[in-house]
């Protein structure tokens, strides 16, 4: 028998520095977690103690903090090289800055293979990008070889900016011939490493003949056997065992997100490459694990540029950006409109001639807007200003909801109106009218939504049975502020870009902004 240790991360989202327990900015260092310096300590400890170790990343290193905003992926290549990752799969967020923003900072600089078998280049891009990422790689480990085959969510064109010259094929269809090719190379230990979410990971384990282990990402799935060490609730045991169509037991793993845990899986193979046993658990990277001094020193060196960036002007406002709780928790506020407009703008993807865009709606809890921005400071808006408005380090995500769920969400928005509570919704691509004289749960008297399947966008009444795409904060997607119906009834959820980054990019693009209060939210006469 031959034993392999798989160390894995996924959805790190530019958490290069240690973070608080909820993966936001570290405040009290003695209680902080994760970060590449701490990760390196643990990885090195395991490499020294065990003979056959692979360090893998399942995608979405890009996007999530000011590190990515400033360094645009160069930080990912640099620190992943320093940690000596063995392979990485491309995630959807690796395309956030377009193909060029993937090629130059990461693909050309990474000293480890970057993989995806289901992304095929065409047209002029094919010649430019070919060979920079691979469908698979064979890695010598001790006296054996291990094949790693990569995959990426086929939803990427709707979630990021890969352009029109990359085709995202069905994962299973694309993986099988590459696994077959590995088999002809006499590689009998094969790991599928990819970024399509836990459901697809399980399907790959079931359907792709020859895959021995699946290491996934995208869905931020936390798996754990025994008592979990922090706040995350396990979605199943680690590893999650899937019985393949040809009768094999295939371990599937994922390691939550944000570099908070290091996935740790031990696999025992027989001489023919069959998995005999698999066990392990994610390792919580808490403050009991010291940060590696040399990596930490490097982080501090790279940090300097971030501090300079946060005070630079992104753009100007010529109007007061009202982000006060007195406004945003009671009525339409122009800060809410600005943020929602930025959220929609960030999700413009013309992937189908029938649609002007795939999504037109935004909802945003008023309680998530934490500060106004005064225009009387020469109109200057900085990252620092935006960090005061959106201090929680969240993301603006894409969900699919039925009209009936949206209706419930808007009823919840005003179910206890008047108490300055955070659930009052700011909107984009939605016209809502409330009648507060009616009883809670029956206060939405009009709810019109902007069409997507149209050449001239216009507002139509919400249809209860129709499925709509909506951009919203991850906080709401996870049921925050009492929006349990969103969490329970959402049909699909894809993580999006860092909230501040979305707004800062929009402001930089627009240069001068002047958001108005324009009647998106109304109260019917006599009730307000």
């Amino acid at each position: 028998a031959w034993e392999l240790t798989i160390l894995h991360t996924n959805d790190v989202h530019s958490r290069l520095e240690q973070t608080s327990e909820d993966s936001s900015k570290c405040v009290n260092a003695s209680r902080c977690m994760g970060g590449v310096a701490r990760l390196f300590t643990k990885v090195q400890q395991i490499r020294r103690a065990e003979p056959n170790v692979l360090l893998l990343d399942a995608g979405d290193q890009y996007q999530g903090t000011i590190w990515f905003t400033v360094y645009k992926g160069a930080e990912v290549a640099h620190f992943m090289n320093a940690l000596r990752y063995d392979a990485m799969a491309l995630g959807n967020h690796e395309f956030d800055n377009g193909v060029e923003g993937l090629i130059e900072p990461l693909l050309k600089e990474a000293k480890f293979p970057i993989l995806s078998a289901n992304i095929k280049a065409k047209g002029p891009l094919a010649s430019q990008i070919s060979g920079l990422y691979l469908p698979y790689k064979v890695l010598p480990v001790g006296d054996e070889v291990v094949g790693i085959v990569g995959y990426t969510s086929k939803e990427t064109p709707f979630l990021s900016n890969p352009g029109t010259n990359l085709v995202f094929e069905d994962e299973i269809t694309a993986l099988q011939p590459e696994v077959d090719k590995l088999k002809t190379l006499n590689v009998n230990k094969i790991i599928a490493l990819g970024h399509s979410g836990f459901e697809m990971d399980k399907l790959i384990a079931q359907k792709v003949r020859g895959v021995d282990v699946v290491v996934g990402g995208h869905s931020n799935t936390f798996l754990y056997t025994g008592n979990p060490p922090s706040k995350e609730v396990p979605a199943g045991k680690y590893p999650f065992i899937v019985t393949s169509d040809d009768g094999r037991k295939v371990p599937v793993v994922q390691a939550y997100a944000f570099g908070k845990y290091l996935g740790y899986l031990k696999i025992e193979f027989d001489e023919r490459g069959n998995v005999i046993s698999s066990h392990g658990n994610p390792i919580l990277l808490n403050s009991s694990i010291p940060e590696d001094p040399s990596i930490k020193a490097d982080i501090n060196k790279w940090r300097i540029k971030l501090d300079n960036y946060s005070t630079q002007e992104l753009g100007k406002t010529i109007v007061y950006l009202d982000g006060s709780s007195q406004s945003c928790r009671f009525r339409e506020c122009n800060m809410g409109n600005l943020i929602c407009d930025a959220m929609i703008n960030n999700n413009l993807r013309h992937t189908d001639e029938m649609f002007w865009n795939h999504v037109s709606m935004c909802i945003l809890n008023g309680g998530g807007i934490r500060s106004p921005i005064d225009e009387r400071n020469n109109g200057t808006i900085t990252w620092e200003n935006l960090a005061a408005v959106l201090p929680f380090g969240g993301t603006f995500d894409l969900v699919q909801l039925k009209g009936s769920t949206l209706k419930k969400a808007f009823e919840h928005s005003v179910h206890r109106y008047g108490q300055s509570t955070g659930e009052f919704l700011q909107v984009g691509g939605i016209h809502v009218v409330y009648d507060l004289s009616r009883k809670p749960g029956d206060r939405v008297v009009k709810l019109d939504v902007l069409c997507t399947k149209c050449r001239v966008p216009s507002y139509d009444p919400l249809k209860m049975d129709e499925v709509y795409k909506v951009i919203l904060p991850n906080f709401l997607a996870n049921g925050g502020d009492g929006f349990q119906m969103i969490k329970d009834e959402l049909l699909r959820h894809d993580s999006g870009d860092q909230d501040i980054n979305v707004v800062s990019t929009y402001i930089s693009k627009m240069k001068v902004i002047y958001p108005a209060v324009e009647g998106r939210i109304k109260f019917s006469t006599g009730s307000h």
Epitope: S130, G131, L132, L134, V138, P140, G147, T184, L185, N186
Partner: antibody, heavy 117, light 107 residues
């Protein structure tokens, strides 16, 4: 440092058999395929076949089946190719070259075989 | 089997020139294209694998590109030591096949 050291020049008569060797160092012999390539004087390169020393699996170019036989001795980290029933057409330089996944990345210096009566 | 064609069998260039050598496959080889260099003494070295990946130790003046059936090798700033014959080779389908080679000479 990866090295593939091939045996020396061979002179043979038509109908003879020859066996050449490729001694390797600097890597784990059993985890890489060993490929063999033929080059006739002033000509291009022709793939003969390959052996996987880890389990002695072989794969051949149809054209060389019956002509070439590939073997490996893992204890000596050495691959062998035997050519039988030699003719003038077999006069060539023969290279051994290893492969892990995408490409034949390190080559031996070549063994020259001359078939003459 | 897949035929690999290097239309230019010999090429003459000056030191410092940018030189491009092309190679065509008889069918789509899905980027499984490698370039090998054979020096006049017979020594063979891998330069580029999977269309554009530089093999370790190969100078960055060598680059590769292409897709589908058409591929090319570029030497951006020709040096004396680059005088050699260059072979393309497909690794998509057995049997592996080579182009006829392009012999590079100095003007």
């Amino acid at each position: 440092e990866v090295q593939l050291q091939q045996s020396g020049t061979v002179l043979a008569r038509p109908g003879d058999s020859v066996k050449m060797s490729c001694k390797t160092s600097g890597y784990t012999f059993t985890t890489y395929w060993m490929h063999w390539v033929k080059q006739r004087p002033g000509q291009g390169l022709e793939w003969i076949g390959a052996i996987y020393p880890g389990n002695s699996d072989t794969t051949y170019n149809q054209k060389f089946k019956g002509k070439a036989k590939l073997t490996a001795v893992t204890s000596a980290s050495t691959a062998y190719m035997k050519l039988s029933s030699l003719t003038n057409e077999d006069s060539a330089v023969y290279y051994c070259t290893r492969l892990l996944d995408y490409a034949m990345d390190y080559w031996g210096q070549g063994t020259s075989v001359t078939v003459s009566s | 089997e897949i035929q690999m064609t290097q239309t230019t069998s010999s090429l003459s260039a000056s030191l410092g020139d940018r030189v491009t050598i092309s190679c065509r496959a008889s069918q789509d080889i899905r980027n499984y294209l490698n370039w090998h260099q054979q020096k006049p003494d017979g020594t063979v070295k891998l330069l580029i694998w999977y269309t554009s990946r530089l093999h370790s130790g190969v100078p960055s003046r060598f680059s590769g590109s292409g897709s589908g059936t058409d591929y090319s090798l570029t030497i951006s700033n020709l040096e004396q030591e680059d005088i050699a014959t260059y072979f393309c080779q497909q690794g998509n389908t057995l049997p592996w096949t080579f182009g006829g080679g392009t012999k590079l000479e100095i003007k």
